[in-house]
Amino acid sequence: SLGSLTVAEPAMIAECKTRTEVFEISRRLIDRTNANFLVWPPCVEVQRCSGCCNNRNVQCRPTQVQLRPVQVRKIEIVRKKPIFKKATVTLEDHLACKCETVAAARPVT
Amino acid sequence: SLGSLTVAEPAMIAECKTRTEVFEISRRLIDRTNANFLVWPPCVEVQRCSGCCNNRNVQCRPTQVQLRPVQVRKIEIVRKKPIFKKATVTLEDHLACKCETVAAARPVT
């Protein structure tokens, strides 16, 4: 909680860089037709570019990306008993970021 | 890019804990009536609970929260000239997290 004498520090910009985010492993990434199963783990950490840039015409974008396959468990429920299978999900990690100009509408010449 | 011999490592759960997130300082947080100004910085870092829990009945929730006032610049544009003012925004940081049972819908009595 706030003390009554808390001083407001100057706000520091959240610079454009990679940060750890949580990626939800949706069941539909594993099997689109069957809903009678669980995925473990339900979420994983990924590295993603975030933060803001000096003005609205530039955005924090990844300049280097790595695809990372991970193995998850697909737990099918058959006659109330779990059957464990393996499935692979490809995650996307951002390795480097940059404030890049947004593809703006070009003037008609 | 993926090498052809890349092995799929077992996926590790993104545990329920605080992570650094980016919070956008909306102009409406500073002044709801006037839109003729800019805010600097446009975004800051906050600590927030994220990650997933063992089952769908529990969610990653903050158990301890701290309010943190920060000082931002409100840059008003008057007759095409910038006028710098100060404003305070109160940020919310999560200090601790826990997998807590989701309040289920209570039966109507």
């Epitope: 990626f23 939800e24 949706s26 990434l29 993603r48 570019c49 990844p62 999900v89 996307e92 951002h94 | -």
Partner: antibody, heavy 120, light 107 residues
Framework: EVQLVESGGGLVQPGGSLRLSCAAS????????MTWVRQAPGKGLEWVAS????????HYPDSVKDRFTVSRDNAKNSLYLQLNSLRAEDTAVYYC?????????????WGQGTLVTVSS | DIQMTQSPSSLSASVGDRVTITCRAS??????LNWYQQKPGKAPKLLIY???SLQSGVPSRFSGSGSGTDFTLTISSLQPEDFATYYC?????????FGGGTKVEIK
């Protein structure tokens, strides 16, 4: 329920620009690749662009490369397509579609489409 | 680029008929083949993915088969709501490409 709603279409002159948007709801948008597909009046379907779940990977056919740019804002559950240097042959209904865990998936859910007309 | 050739481009059939549409890829695409149905003024709808897997909610009268370069979409007993245009699409390599479509009309 999965919903994809496109907007931003309209009449534009040759050489002009337009920005299409697709608002997504009912699924974990940030977990899925997204795609734009177009259909010229009375013609078949043509793939236009795809973008990875995190926005770091994009793919285009040669017909639109260097003119169209796909992007996304996962915080806003939104997909975008910036159309520059438009030509008469770009006239079409533009659909956004959810395309699974990678580019080599199918197009599972589609929006209703937004019409782009390029004419002087 | 992989070319997808559908045949026939159009066909007339009656309710209850068995309808077969074929799709040929210009090179082998394994089972990376999807089928869509489109009705006038509507968005396409996924019917079959991975050559033979029935999309959730799609009636079992629709089936897909094939591998490599030759693929088939079969409607075992045509229903009134099945009159539409059908497209195949390969997702084996970019650029992703569609067949020209097959329009199924009422005889």
């Amino acid at each position: 329920e999965v919903q994809l709603v496109e907007s931003g279409g309209g009449l534009v002159q040759p050489g002009g620009s337009l920005r299409l948007s697709c608002a997504a709801s009912g699924f974990t948008f940030s977990s899925f690749w997204m795609t734009w597909v177009r259909q010229a009046p009375g013609k078949g379907l043509e793939w236009v662009a795809s973008i990875s779940a995190g926005g770091g990977i994009t793919h285009y056919p040669d017909s639109v490369k260097d003119r169209f740019t796909v992007s996304r804002d996962n915080a806003k559950n939104s997909l975008y397509l910036q159309l520059n240097s438009l030509r008469a042959e770009d006239t079409a209904v533009y659909y956004c579609a959810e395309s699974g865990g990678d580019i080599y998936s199918d197009f599972d859910y589609w929006g209703q489409g937004t019409l782009v007309t390029v004419s002087s | 680029d992989i070319q997808m050739t559908q045949s026939p481009s159009s066909l007339s059939a009656s309710v209850g008929d068995r309808v077969t549409i074929t799709c040929r890829a210009s090179q082998s695409i394994s089972n990376y083949l999807n089928w869509y149905q489109q009705k006038p003024g509507k968005a396409p709808k996924l019917l079959i993915y991975a050559a033979s897997s029935l999309q959730s909610g799609v009636p079992s009268r629709f089936s897909g088969s094939g591998s490599g370069t030759d693929f088939t979409l079969t409607i075992s007993s045509l229903q009134p709501e099945d009159f539409a245009t059908y497209y195949c699409q390969q997702s084996y390599s970019t650029p992703l490409t569609f067949g020209g479509g097959t329009k199924v009309e009422i005889k």
